[in-house]
């Protein structure tokens, strides 16, 4: 059983990935980012079903993509750079999903925009989040 | 129809500099990236970098960050890359390249015929 | 930055052969969410700009002959040409443009026997 510590890092990481991609979004946002529409054309996939931490799979098989549609912007638009701040999130994401179960994402048929993926996944966290508190 | 049309070949002095354009027609080259790659015989193909012509905004890698500028002017439709402390390694042909699409997944599908840059003293 | 390893160097052929050309990438290429392959093979003749053949690994560019196939997943992919004519000469070079910086394979001379 998950104990009150354990619990509570968990929440401090998420709260820490919630953050990260809040910070993304804003970014991408922002109203001097010249490179939205252009953004807006990538392609991003979400998981059918997104309810508990093993789902963040889903989340970290796109990370590499979202790396590259961050090199696109400016990056004055984020305090890191779009590498930096991918690893970030990838650690988190892995201490959070745990690497001893192998979990087998499954993709929903339709795609989204960043600004769609961005706030699914920030939609996960804050969920989680509640759950915990 | 989509073409890139590169200007003539260029013969260089060691540590002199050469300025080379891109000139895009059938498509506003605002709409897509333009990428520079290096064409040596022994070496291959290596990518320079692209440029946002709709910005202005570069990214180059590592190896060529102090040796190219890349730079666009929308009016002409046309991409620049300036080449500077030129040494006999730079002797190559330097290509540019569109996507196949605009949505960054795509690999270069149109090129220009290439420009040819000597350095020889 | 992903490296490509391309083998053969050279490879000399007769008419009418069939060739295999391997290209193995340091990383996968495969993104999960559409299955796809962001590796990509060019024929470059001398003298000649690349010619976009295969993209996403396996699917044809428009007006290439059916005779050019790619397959493979993850980090190892072939370029096979059955068939081969005398026009097939050239250079044949993968790329990968999954991960920045993009970066080619060092290329395959396909040269006559």
């Known amino acids: 059983a998950p104990t009150s510590s354990s619990t509570k890092k968990t929440q401090l990481q998420l709260e820490h990935l919630l953050l990260d991609l809040q910070m993304i979004l804003n970014g991408i946002n922002n109203y001097k980012n010249p490179k939205l529409t252009r953004m807006l054309t990538f392609k991003f996939y979400m998981p059918k079903k997104a309810t508990e931490l093993k789902h963040l799979q889903c989340l970290e098989e796109e990370l590499k993509p979202l790396e590259e549609v961050l090199n696109l912007a400016q990056s004055k638009n984020f305090h890191l750079r779009p590498r930096d701040l991918i690893s970030n999130i990838n650690v988190i994401v892995l201490e959070l999903k745990g690497s001893e179960t192998t979990f087998m994402c499954e993709y929903a048929d339709e795609t989204a925009t960043i600004v769609e993926f961005l706030n699914r996944w920030i939609t996960f966290c804050q969920s989680i989040i509640s759950t915990l508190t | 129809e989509i073409q890139l049309q590169q200007s003539g070949p260029e013969l260089r002095r060691p540590g002199s500099s050469v300025k080379l354009s891109c000139k895009a027609s059938g498509y506003n080259i605002t709409d897509y990236l333009i990428h520079w790659v290096r064409h040596r015989p022994e070496h291959g193909l290596e990518w320079i970098g692209w440029?946002?012509?709709?910005?202005?905004?570069?990214r180059y890698a590592q190896k060529f960050q102090s040796k190219a500028t890349l730079t666009a002017d929308t009016s002409s439709n046309a991409a620049y890359m300036q080449l500077s402390s030129l040494t006999p390694e730079d002797t190559a042909t330097y290509f540019c390249?569109?996507?196949?699409?605009?949505?960054?997944?795509?690999?270069?599908?149109?090129w220009g015929q290439g420009t040819l840059v000597t350095v020889s003293s | 930055d992903i490296v490509m390893t391309q083998s053969p160097f050279s490879l000399a052929v007769s008419e009418g052969e069939m060739v295999t050309i391997n290209c193995k990438s340091s990383?996968?290429?495969?993104?999960?969410?559409?299955?796809?392959?962001?590796l990509a093979w060019y024929q470059q003749k001398p003298g000649q700009s690349p010619k976009l053949l295969i993209y996403y690994a396996s699917t044809g560019q428009s007006g290439v002959p059916d005779r050019f196939i790619g397959s493979g997943s993850g980090t190892d992919f072939t370029l096979t040409i059955s068939d081969v004519q005398a026009e097939d000469l050239a250079d044949y070079y993968c790329?990968?443009?999954?991960?920045?910086?993009?970066?080619f394979g060092a290329g395959t001379k396909l040269e006559l026997k």
């Open positions: 440029i946002d012509p709709e910005d202005g905004e570069t």
């Open positions: 990383q996968s290429l495969l993104r999960s969410g559409n299955q796809k392959n962001y």
């Open positions: 390249a569109r996507s196949l699409d605009s949505t960054y997944d795509y690999p270069f599908a149109y």
């Open positions: 790329l990968q443009h999954y991960i920045s910086p993009p970066t």
